[in-house]
Amino acid sequence: APTSSSTSSSTAEAQQQQQQQQQQQQHLEQLLMDLQELLSRMENYRNLKLPRMLTFKFYLPKQATELKDLQCLEDELGPLRHVLDLTQSKSFQLEDAENFISNIRVTVVKLKGSDNTFECQFDDESATVVDFLRRWIAFCQSIISTSPQ
């Protein structure tokens, strides 16, 4: 029969696991919110009739189903910041692109872990910044919906 000490340690483990899952859920929701915020600003940019933002190419993973695939998002944060930096001077109301991207990067690292040995396999087909953001928003939504509550 399990001793009271082993029962309490397994309960503690279960609690810790539940806590980790809750944190993971929070980080995913934070990432989702940040990406949606960026996309809505892009859509606003579209309404300002400034289509040259769509000349920039972004790369998406061949397939993204796990948190480790967020490495592919992290790899593209530099180019994303470049686009935001360039567009800030043209009615793109994002106060601090560097800070915004930095926050996304921190959230991504928390979710995928700091191990950078996983090499992303990018799709040959490139995407516009709008499609890039939409794809990662869909990824977050998919992981959130399949996570145990």
């Epitope: 009739k49 400034l50 040259r52 933002m53 769509l54 920039f56 190419k57 360039l86 516009t128």
Partner: antibody
Framework: QVQLVQSGAEVKKPGASVKVSCKAS????????ISWVRQAPGQGLEWMGW????????NYAQKLQGRVTMTTDTSTSTAYMELRSLRSDDTAVYYC???????????????????WGQGTLVTVSS | SYELTQPPSVSVSPGQTARITCSGD??????AYWYQQKSGQAPVMVIY???KRPPGIPERFSGSSSGTMATLTITGAQVEDEADYYC???????????FGGGTKLTVL
């Protein structure tokens, strides 16, 4: 249907200025930009610059900076390109072209120069 | 200033595949566009966003891009495809546009 109608041919002396107009019809003028492209006789296409008909933002080719000015008059849906201090190597056909984006399946793509004016021949000769 | 480099001329026989290349340092991060210009006419877009065909452009026209090189391919070139072809893109900042020097396609 979309049309860009340009002003007629011009003959100018070196050092003079020329102003070419481009009247747009068949679409919402302020939803697009206008680029100006020129082509010297027997030569390739050269992008000169771009103006947003929405807010008047401009970007000019580096080599023409200081000599070219692009403007729009939204009340008449007309774009203008003025080139100053003309030289003989400015002899060319000058085109205006619509520049914007297309949206379908909720995706957007930059869609430059889907409609062009008929071209305006500017001859610079002493 | 930013440049796009194209071969001055390409020749193919009718029915053959013509490939016209365009190289530029910013192309890994910028989409390429292709225009066809026949003698005495304004240019016509045949490819946008590296590989997409505008409505009305025949299926034999296709585009691709890899690294610093974009390619326009005409599969089964026809005599009426004889024209000058220009690639077009924007610099790494996105504000300044540039055309390649143009390629004269001859379909003999």
């Amino acid at each position: 249907q979309v049309q860009l109608v340009q002003s007629g041919a011009e003959v100018k002396k070196p050092g003079a200025s020329v102003k070419v107009s481009c009247k747009a019809s068949g679409y919402t003028f302020t939803s697009y930009g206008i680029s100006w492209v020129r082509q010297a006789p027997g030569q390739g296409l050269e992008w000169m610059g771009w103006i947003s008909a929405y807010n008047g933002n401009t970007n000019y080719a580096q080599k023409l900076q200081g000599r070219v000015t692009m403007t729009t008059d939204t009340s008449t849906s007309t774009a203008y390109m003025e080139l100053r201090s003309l030289r003989s190597d400015d002899t060319a056909v000058y085109y205006c072209a619509r520049e914007g984006a297309i949206y379908y399946d909720s995706s957007g793509y930059y869609f430059p120069f889907d409609y062009w004016g008929q071209g305006t021949l500017v001859t610079v000769s002493s | 200033s930013y440049e796009l480099t194209q071969p001055p001329s390409v020749s193919v026989s009718p029915g053959q595949t013509a490939r016209i290349t365009c190289s530029g340092d910013a192309l890994p991060r910028k989409f390429a566009y292709w225009y066809q210009q026949k003698s005495g006419q304004a240019p016509v877009m045949v490819i946008y966003g590296d590989s997409k065909r505008p409505p009305g452009i025949p299926e034999r026209f296709s585009g691709s891009s890899s690294g610093t090189m974009a390619t326009l391919t005409i599969t089964g070139a026809q005599v009426e495809d004889e024209a000058d072809y220009y690639c077009y893109s924007t610099d790494s900042g996105g504000d300044v546009s540039v055309f390649g020097g143009g390629t004269k396609l001859t379909v003999l």
